[in-house]
């Protein structure tokens, strides 16, 4: 009975309980290929829980190994268009610092209009995940189709 | 030492570690898109720890942000049978009670016969999951091609 | 504050913490269906803590329910590849020992080049998973493209 | 106890036809769905149709065209009708109720080329 007072009276992130749901605000301009994310119980299930949103970019506040969990759907799309729009493809990288950059998740439409996926991935503090979808086609912002999270799973 | 002792003396439940993963038990009666699921260790690993089934589908006992994952294949399926019964879609949302139903995971089958995603969401005690699959095609029993779960992450 | 010192003054195998995160290092011989894996930090991101390799198979080292998730793209694939390659499978179970041998999680590729895809499982110290892909398409080998993991999440 | 029975195989000539008759002693098939599976000489047990309860059908890729499976809610019957039967055709097979684990004894199909 102690251990679970204890737990409940630590602030959670003190057990390291990081987590972030997010959904989509909107496409970046011309020659970005970033998607831009927003996350708050304003705006409905989204929220974040200790990591942060840099201009609609999420940054990770605590070190270890986190679950990075996707899917993007494509905004009127049918598996003739995305055929025809192809090659149309989801990347999820580290973007910032530059000396971390790397692709974490990458997957391509092919005849379908929704990608899913998910994987582990060790993330450190100030890690910052940038989302690139790259062609013509356009993201769907109804939330129950576009959304992007990251769990905290261990040090 | 103390705190791993401590930890195995409580019941898991006290650490909120709710988790599910159902396996597909039928479909619902003409008119119900509802999927109807069971779990047990007599049906193989399809388990309830902490969230029970009412009439097949999926009741949350504790409050909490829950990773819900998802996995449906279509029964005799090709990507010919796909696109000619397009749309076929699966969609995951809180369906009782009726002042929180909201879709929280929307997938479309599109050419493939197999959708799989998941997704971070808070779910409160009471809240109870339906999957609806909607159009004329119908989804596979066999245990590793169809199943549905949820996993307690966090207050 | 107590329990936030004694958590990090345990060991994190002593929690149950068990994880791992796998790339593809090849895929068998002719006749061996199973693809082969590899983990460690002087890999690039993939790691293990907790299970093991056992000539490139994982195998577990702690009872538990795990969530197992796994993505393969193939290599030079478009969807007209995938669909005249039809059917490829990749099938996720355990393999050994014989007594438990069960498959967990299966998907076809149709007209996609990339399936992707998790779900919760019971496992026991000792289970060896193996991951099948049945068919003439080879996987892709990058690291963001191709990768196999479990996390242990309760007792 | 419920049960299902087929009916309606037999040895025939490539090209040629036969009807699958599946009966159960229960208004069962009425409100379920219903499957014809197949099983040939040393390869696993396959799902060759599938039919829901308002009569919405679906038929493997490999039997598109030659077979159909149907059903008489009224008679408590279902059926496969198949035409233009192969050697590949040939098996035994099984009515299922799809959802549950209830399956006939099987009836024998032979095509002889």
């Known amino acids: 009975q102690r251990f679970a007072q204890a737990q409940q009276q630590l602030p959670l992130e003190s057990l390291g309980w990081d987590v972030a749901e997010l959904q989509l605000n909107h496409t970046g301009p011309q020659q970005d290929p970033r998607l831009y994310w927003q996350g708050g119980p304003a705006l409905g299930r989204s929220f974040l829980h200790g990591p942060e949103l840099d201009k609609g970019q999420l940054r990770i506040h605590r070190d270890g190994i986190y679950m990075v969990h996707i899917q993007v759907t494509l905004a009127i799309c049918s598996s003739t268009t995305a055929s025809r729009h192809h090659p149309t493809t989801l990347a999820v990288g580290i973007c910032s610092p530059a000396s971390r950059s790397i692709s974490l998740l990458r997957l391509s439409f092919h005849q379908g209009c929704t990608i899913a996926s998910q994987r582990l991935t060790p993330l450190a503090r100030g890690d910052t995940l940038c989302t690139n979808l790259t062609g013509t086609l356009l993201p769907s912002r109804n939330t129950d189709e576009t959304f992007f999270g990251v769990q905290w799973v261990r040090p | 030492q103390r705190f791993a002792q401590a930890q195995q003396q409580l019941p898991l439940e006290s650490l909120g570690w709710d988790v599910a993963e159902l396996q597909l038990n039928h479909t619902g009666p003409q008119q119900d898109p509802r999927l109807y699921w069971q779990g047990g260790p007599a049906l193989g690993r399809s388990f309830l720890h902490g969230p029970e089934l009412d009439k097949g589908q999926l009741r949350i006992h504790r409050d909490g942000i829950y990773m819900v994952h998802i996995q449906v294949t279509l029964a005799i399926c090709s990507s010919t049978t796909a696109s000619r019964h397009h749309p076929t879609t699966l969609a995951v949302g809180i369906c009782s009670p009726a002042s929180r139903s909201i879709s929280l995971l929307r997938l479309s089958f599109h050419q493939g016969c197999t959708i799989a995603s998941q997704r971070l969401t808070p779910l409160a005690r009471g809240d109870t999951l339906c999957t609806n699959l909607t159009g004329t095609l119908l989804p596979s029993r066999n245990t590793d091609e169809t199943f549905f779960g949820v996993q307690w992450v966090r207050p | 504050q107590r329990f936030a010192q004694a958590q990090q003054q345990l060991p994190l195998e002593s929690l149950g913490w068990d994880v791992a995160e796998l790339q593809l290092n090849h895929t068998g011989p002719q006749q061996d269906p199973r693809l082969y894996w590899q983990g460690g930090p002087a890999l690039g991101r993939s790691f293990l803590h907790g299970p093991e390799l056992d000539k490139g198979q994982l195998r577990i080292h702690r009872d538990g329910i795990y969530m197992v998730h796994i993505q393969v793209t193939l290599a030079i694939c478009s969807s007209t590849t995938a669909s005249r390659h039809h059917p490829t499978t990749l099938a996720v179970g355990i393999c050994s020992p014989a007594s438990r041998s069960i498959s967990l999680l299966r998907l076809s590729f149709h007209q996609g080049c990339t399936i992707a895809s998790q779900r919760l499982t019971p496992l026991a110290r000792g289970d060896t998973l193996c991951t099948n892909l049945t068919g003439t398409l080879l996987p892709s080998r990058n690291t963001d493209e191709t990768f196999f993991g479990v996390q242990w999440v309760r007792p | 106890q419920v049960q299902l029975q087929e009916s309606g195989g037999g040895l025939v000539q490539a090209g040629g036809s036969l009807r699958l008759s599946c009966a159960a002693s229960k208004s069962i098939i009425r409100d379920n769905v219903m499957a014809w599976h197949r099983q040939a000489p040393g390869k696993q047990r396959e799902l060759v149709a599938i039919?829901?309860?308002?009569?919405?059908?679906n038929v493997d890729d490999s039997v598109k065209g030659r077979f159909t499976i149907s059903r008489d809610n009224a008679k408590n019957m279902v059926y496969l009708q198949m035409n233009n039967l192969k050697p590949e055709d040939t098996a035994v097979y099984y009515c299922n109720v799809y959802y549950r684990d209830l399956w006939g004894q099987g009836t024998q199909v032979t095509v002889s080329s």
């Open positions: 039919i829901n309860t308002g009569g919405s059908a």
